[in-house]
């Protein structure tokens, strides 16, 4: 079917919001009041991938921008980046694996595991105003749990 998408924002389990930091990076920080308008709105697309009863494959694009979160190797390390795509061809149901994240719901919290690099997750730091990154550990200092807020289109 034409790819199903919804608009949403994400906050980490410490309630930090995600905002743009330069043209190709996201950072996480606490926002209040009118500053909440700075947070990025994602277009979450439900794509084909290794779907299971517990994991749903999604792609995370930035709403009305031709940018998608993707996972690539940089200096031999799995790395999160914002990648520019041709808006005529995206989103699509059969996304390249680097764009696919397994959305995992546990206790009303969401994790986003890279499909390209299993056991690597979209992560934020405890510290304020730091980049959103791909982390290889769960349950440590870094934060891998998020909540999702629906945004009307």
């Amino acid at each position: 079917a034409p790819v199903r998408s919804l608009n949403c924002t994400l906050r980490d389990s410490q309630q930090k919001s995600l905002v743009m930091s330069g043209p190709y990076e996201l950072k996480a920080l606490h926002l209040q009041g009118q500053d909440m308008e700075q947070q990025v709105v994602f277009s979450m697309s439900f794509v084909q991938g290794e779907e299971s009863n517990d994991k749903i494959p999604v792609a995370l694009g930035l709403k009305e921008k031709n940018l998608y979160l993707s996972c690539v190797l940089k200096d031999d390390k799995p790395t999160l980046q914002l990648e520019s795509v041709d808006p005529k061809n995206y989103p699509k149901k059969k996304m390249e694996k680097r764009f696919v994240f397994n959305k995992i719901e546990i206790n009303n919290k969401l994790e986003f595991e890279s499909a390209q690099f299993p056991n690597w997750y979209i992560s934020t730091s405890q510290a304020e105003n730091m980049p959103v990154f791909l982390g290889g550990t769960k349950g440590g200092q870094d934060i891998t749990d998020f909540t999702m807020q629906f945004v009307s289109s």
């Epitope: 079917a1 084909q48 517990d54």
Partner: antibody, heavy 122, light 107 residues
Framework: EVQLQESGPGLVKPSETLSLTCTVS????????VSWIRQPPGKGLEWLGL???????YYNSPLKSRLTISKDNSKSQVSLKLSSVTAADTAVYYC????????????????WGQGTLVTVSS | DIQMTQSPSSLSASVGDRVTITCQTS??????MNWYQQKPGKAPKLLIS???HLRPGVPSRFSGSGSGTDFTFTISSLQPEDFATYYC?????????FGQGTKLEIK
């Protein structure tokens, strides 16, 4: 050459657990998903569930509480266990490899085993 | 779950005939339709994936078309070895669902 072969007991008693093994060759279980499908005698095909290369599983809802699919990559074997069987579970059981085309892993199945008939009867 | 309506359930035809089988889905599945051939006592064989993509080694007399909810499978000129049962399968989303099958018999 891709090959899949199902094996297991041909007769299972009601309320017991049906256990089947699918042994594969010509591809790696860490790279491709494997589905199980069944066909009651003279009837159509029913998809039961699958196990992905990474080990995650998806089970068809009506069977979810009774079905377990697991695998051993090193032995190139996938197993199916269906508990609390009744006569309605009598069928030919097939395992089949997930399709890959143009680098995409599709949900469909391209290569199938020859199937094994399992009869549930006391 | 996506419901599949395959028709006809059975069909009598002669060698050389052109045969068409249709499959309708209860939801839009884009091009994620597959067609299988099954002979008695044998496993199904994948003939067409992604709606119209002929699998390697499958004769060109077999073809598929359609997208969305309406799909067609055609054999342009029936050969003796084509008499079998044909199934459609949607692979858009889980659970995967098959059509009820079309038994193609010799007239």
């Amino acid at each position: 050459e891709v090959q899949l072969q199902e094996s297991g007991p041909g007769l299972v008693k009601p309320s017991e657990t049906l256990s089947l093994t699918c042994t594969v060759s010509g591809f790696s279980l860490s790279d491709f998903g494997v589905s199980w499908i069944r066909q009651p005698p003279g009837k159509g095909l029913e998809w039961l569930g699958l196990i992905w290369g990474g080990g995650d599983t998806y089970y068809n809802s009506p069977l979810k509480s009774r079905l377990t699919i697991s695998k051993d990559n090193s032995k190139s074997q996938v197993s199916l266990k269906l508990s609390s069987v009744t006569a309605a579970d009598t069928a030919v059981y097939y395992c089949a490899k997930q399709t890959n085309i143009w680098g995409y892993d599709l949900y469909s199945m391209d290569y199938w085993g020859q199937g094994t008939l399992v009869t549930v009867s006391s | 779950d996506i419901q599949m309506t395959q028709s006809p359930s059975s069909l009598s035809a002669s060698v050389g005939d052109r045969v068409t089988i249709t499959c309708q889905t209860s939801q839009d599945i884009d091009d994620d339709m597959n067609w299988y051939q099954q002979k008695p006592g044998k496993a199904p064989k994948l003939l067409i994936s992604l709606g119209s993509h002929l699998r390697p080694g499958v004769p060109s007399r077999f073809s598929g078309s359609g997208s969305g909810t309406d799909f067609t499978f055609t054999i342009s000129s029936l050969q003796p070895e084509d008499f079998a049962t044909y199934y459609c399968l949607q692979s858009d989303r889980f659970p995967l669902t098959f059509g009820q099958g079309t038994k193609l018999e010799i007239k």
